[in-house]
Interface confidence: low
């Protein structure tokens, strides 16, 4: 038989025995001559090296390139392939020789007392026990122990081949400690050497690289990559790395087994690749492959090597961010850099710290943005190695949909006396300012619920036919004033006013404001009454703990059953697009109050007294009167505001001053508080008494000292007191110059 590929114009070596297989008896001589066209060598079984003493290779006497192999008294162990080949080529001729030795049918390895077979417990894998035969057609079975089991060739997955050995599925003998082959010749049993069975695993569960991704270094830094393979037990792992610069001087590879917990069904292997000082050529893909022989798993990661540490903003970094109140705002710091920079956010120059409303990290997150968040935000990136800094300013503009102030200030229902001139106001706050404020109206009787009608939760009015105020036919004569702009509570607001020249008809008015991010509206119930009138005694706006009484006066000949109510918390608050329910048609929202009735010659007066007003008493008070003839109810509503008690404070300071004799001193002391405090002046801790030269004006707020004299020098104190305490300020007045002598002297 011939093996190898023919090289140019070179014939295969020719053997003297032109057969693939030669069978000879033991104790005979084996002689084969090989002829060729260049230097030849022989290889034979067991000892392939040519140092066997019994084997003789001689040059032929009759040819240049010719060698004869001779083995006298052959034994069974000489069975095998004999190969004649050209030196340093693959060209060879092979003959397989069986040396039939019936006393030793299995070829024994020269050195081995026993062999080792490695198997995996894989259903699909077979193992070969290398019990080769010196006779080709033996009846061979495999014995495994313990417990003892015998396996016979089945013509399928179990077989014996004299040149190869005994083939069997590995799982069948994985239980065994040892196996051997057995041949029967003329009722005589012959055994091969023993083979110890070693079960090896092969499964690799995973291969993990650490760090797994985003590896960035700068030139000169150390790269350490750990590759961990997790396998089943009895596995040996061979690691193989692929990386960009394979000719690396400073590369170091360390492989080791990792300890796992006892009883673990898993083994861990670690391979660590270290490059002490990376260069730009080390940038690229690093792949670690772990192989168990039957299985290979790999994992890769990209290593980026920068020339030097750096930091820069990414192209997607925003400069203007627009948001609407209440939204969540996210401003990411988009950067390029190595190593990752330290990120610090500033608002209008002040460092931002994270809290429950704001998170200042890689992304600046404002949970619920409000107007006060408007401003310039500066993000500063600092490279932790080079300390290089980059800054970028992001302007945040927070838009506010129109908010109508009166919604929260004025009652949703109010009554107006017949024939009076009234002004309705919408004060709108919006960013950007509203691009329009429009007024609409509709008649109250067209849109109010009759008591018999079921009130729909989503729409408390059966109609929504709003008409433009330009079309006031059938309603009150209206004039819309030009919008004005006012600074209220430090905010720029747009004020739209609608003047009703004569209150003749009950109607509903709506102002609607629109800007780029939304709309707001306010519905005003303009209920016109010829009925009762409400007055407050003694003050329009009482302070806490003061007494106040609400007087409801009605013509006795027209009205009866006067009753005071307080408007309770409404079950249907007013939303965008909804209208207030007229009070008289919805008594469910009213709380009846105790009151005292008085009469005079023409009117009934129902007085409801609040002896000790508190902030809880604030709200809408309703006086209801019934028409004696028609029994129709008439309502008047009055909003009561109770002012909170505030201790006295003095705004501004008295300042020490130096004045020349004969000049004047003018100082003022402005005090605030509720109830309003009384102001008193003291000189050197004694009450200051008015005389021709000392004048107190405006409730003692202003003090004037005319034609000052030396004796006017001293410590002046302004003191403001109320039931809640006192506040005071002091100043020292110095009088310079000599006192003029009077004529009397």
């Amino acid at each position: 038989a011939s093996v190898g590929l023919p090289s140019v114009s070179l014939d295969l070596p020719r053997l003297s025995i032109q057969k693939d297989i030669l069978t000879i008896k033991a104790n005979t001589t084996l002689q084969i001559t090989c002829r060729g066209q260049r230097d030849l060598d022989w290889l034979w079984p067991n000892n392939q090296s040519g140092s066997e003493q019994r084997v003789e290779v001689t040059e032929c006497s009759d040819g240049l390139f010719c060698k004869t192999l001779t083995i006298p008294k052959v034994i069974g162990n000489d069975t095998g392939a004999y190969k004649c080949f050209y030196r340093e080529t693959d060209l060879a001729s092979v003959i397989y020789v069986y040396v039939q030795d019936y006393r030793s049918p299995f070829i024994a390895s020269v050195s081995d007392q026993h062999g080792v077979v490695y198997i995996t417990e894989n259903k699909n894998k077979t193992v070969v026990i290398p019990c080769l035969g010196s006779i080709s057609n033996l009846n061979v079975s495999l014995c495994a122990r313990y417990p003892e089991k015998r396996f016979v060739p089945d013509g399928n997955r179990i077989s014996w081949d004299s040149k190869k050995g005994f083939t069997i599925p590995s799982y069948m003998i994985s239980y065994a400690g040892m196996v051997f082959c057995e041949a029967k010749i003329n009722d005589e049993s012959y055994q091969s050497i023993m083979y110890i069975v070693v079960v090896v695993g092969y499964r690799i569960y995973d291969v993990v690289l650490s760090p797994s991704h985003g590896i960035e270094l700068s030139v000169g830094e150390k790269l350490v990559l750990n590759c961990t393979a997790r396998t089943e037990l009895n596995v040996g792992i061979d690691f193989n790395w692929e990386y960009p610069s394979s000719k690396h001087q400073h590369k170091k590879l360390v492989n080791r087994d990792l300890k796992t917990q006892s009883g673990s069904e898993m083994k861990k292997f670690l391979s660590t690749l270290t490059i002490d000082g990376v260069t730009r050529s080390d940038q690229g893909l690093y792949t670690c492959a772990a192989s168990s022989g039957l299985m290979t798993k790999k994992n890769s990661t990209f290593v980026r090597v920068h020339e030097k540490p750096f930091v820069a903003f990414g192209s997607g970094m925003e400069s203007l961010v627009e948001a609407t109140v209440g939204e969540r705002v996210r401003i990411p710091a988009k950067y390029l850099g190595y190593p990752p920079p330290e990120i610090k956010w500033y608002k209008n120059g002040i460092p931002l710290e994270s809290n429950h409303t704001i998170k200042a990290g890689h992304v600046l997150t404002i949970m619920e943005v409000s107007e006060r968040d408007t401003g310039n935000y500066t993000v500063i990136l600092t490279n932790p190695i080079s300390k290089e800094k980059q800054s970028h300013v992001v302007s945040l503009v927070v838009y506010v949909p129109p908010q109508i102030g009166e919604k929260s200030l004025i009652s949703p229902v109010d009554s107006y006396q017949y024939g009076t001139t009234q002004t309705l106001t919408c004060t709108v706050y919006a960013i950007p300012p509203p691009h329009h404020i429009h007024w609409y109206w509709q008649l109250e009787e067209e849109c109010a619920n009759e008591p018999s009608q079921a009130v729909s939760v989503t729409n408390p009015y059966p109609c929504e036919e709003w008409r433009s105020v330009e079309d006031f036919q059938g309603g009150n004569k209206i004039e819309v004033n030009k919008n004005q702009f006012a600074l209220i509570e430090g905010k720029n607001k747009t004020v739209s006013t609608l003047v009703i020249q004569a209150a003749n008809v009950s109607a509903l008015y709506k102002c609607e404001a629109v800007n780029k991010v939304g709309r707001g509206e306010r519905v005003i119930s303009f209920h016109v009454t010829r009925g009762p009138e409400i007055t407050l005694q003694p003050d329009m706006q009482p302070t806490e703990q003061e007494s106040v009484s609400l007087w409801c006066t009605a013509d006795r000949s027209t009205f009866e059953n006067l009753t005071w109510y307080k408007l309770g918390p409404q079950p249907l608050p007013i939303h965008v697009g909804e209208l207030p329910t007229p009070v008289c048609k919805n008594l469910d929202t009213l709380w009846k109050l105790n009151a005292t009735m008085f009469s005079n010659s023409t009117n009934d007066i129902l007085i409801m007294e609040l002896k000790n007003a508190s902030l809880q008493d604030q709200g809408d008070y309703v006086c209801l009167a019934q028409d004696r003839k028609t029994k129709k109810r008439h309502c008047v509503v009055r909003q009561l505001t109770v002012l909170e008690r505030v201790a006295p404070t003095i705004t501004g300071n008295l300042e020490n001053q130096t004045t020349s004799i004969g000049e004047s001193i003018e100082v003022s002391c402005t005090a605030s508080g509720n109830p309003p405090p009384q102001i008193m002046w003291f000189k050197d801790n004694e009450t200051l008494v008015e005389d021709s030269g000392i004048v107190l004006k405006d409730g003692n707020r202003n003090l004037t000292i005319r034609r000052v004299r030396k004796e006017d020098e001293g410590l002046y104190t302004c003191q403001a007191c109320s039931v809640l305490g006192c506040a005071k300020v002091e100043a020292f007045f110095i009088i310079e110059g000599a006192q003029e002598k009077t004529n009397l002297e």
């Epitope: 209440g326 939760v457 989503t458 918390p569 079950p571 249907l572 608050p573 939303h575 909804e578």
Partner: nanobody, 124 residues
Framework: QVQLQESGGGSVQAGGSLRLSCVAS????????MGWFRQAPGKEREGVAG????????YYANSVKGRFTISQDNAKNTVYLQMNTLKPEDTAIYYC?????????????????WGQGTQVTVSS
Amino acid sequence: QVQLQESGGGSVQAGGSLRLSCVASGYSVSKNSMGWFRQAPGKEREGVAGINYGGTATYYANSVKGRFTISQDNAKNTVYLQMNTLKPEDTAIYYCAAGSPDPPPLIEGVVKYWGQGTQVTVSS
């Protein structure tokens, strides 16, 4: 400080009914939107029903539509969840949730305050 206290949970046979209550203290249910969430064993918390401020609109998850009803009593500052035709898959801890006036709390991200939860067990 805001507190939401649920009650009304318990065990019931499939097909039965329960009414859960949630009393709010330190928080007005009429001025804010409210909702109910539930968390079944091994599952994430999910929105079941919501009601906007003022109670003018109600919202339900598909799984409970037609069987559960959310309502509120402003005077009692209480939100209710009426659960009819209960199924074993309704078994969960039910949580009361409070949001801002808008939107109603149907997802966790808009919830401002949570109750402690009440167990509902429906057996077949």
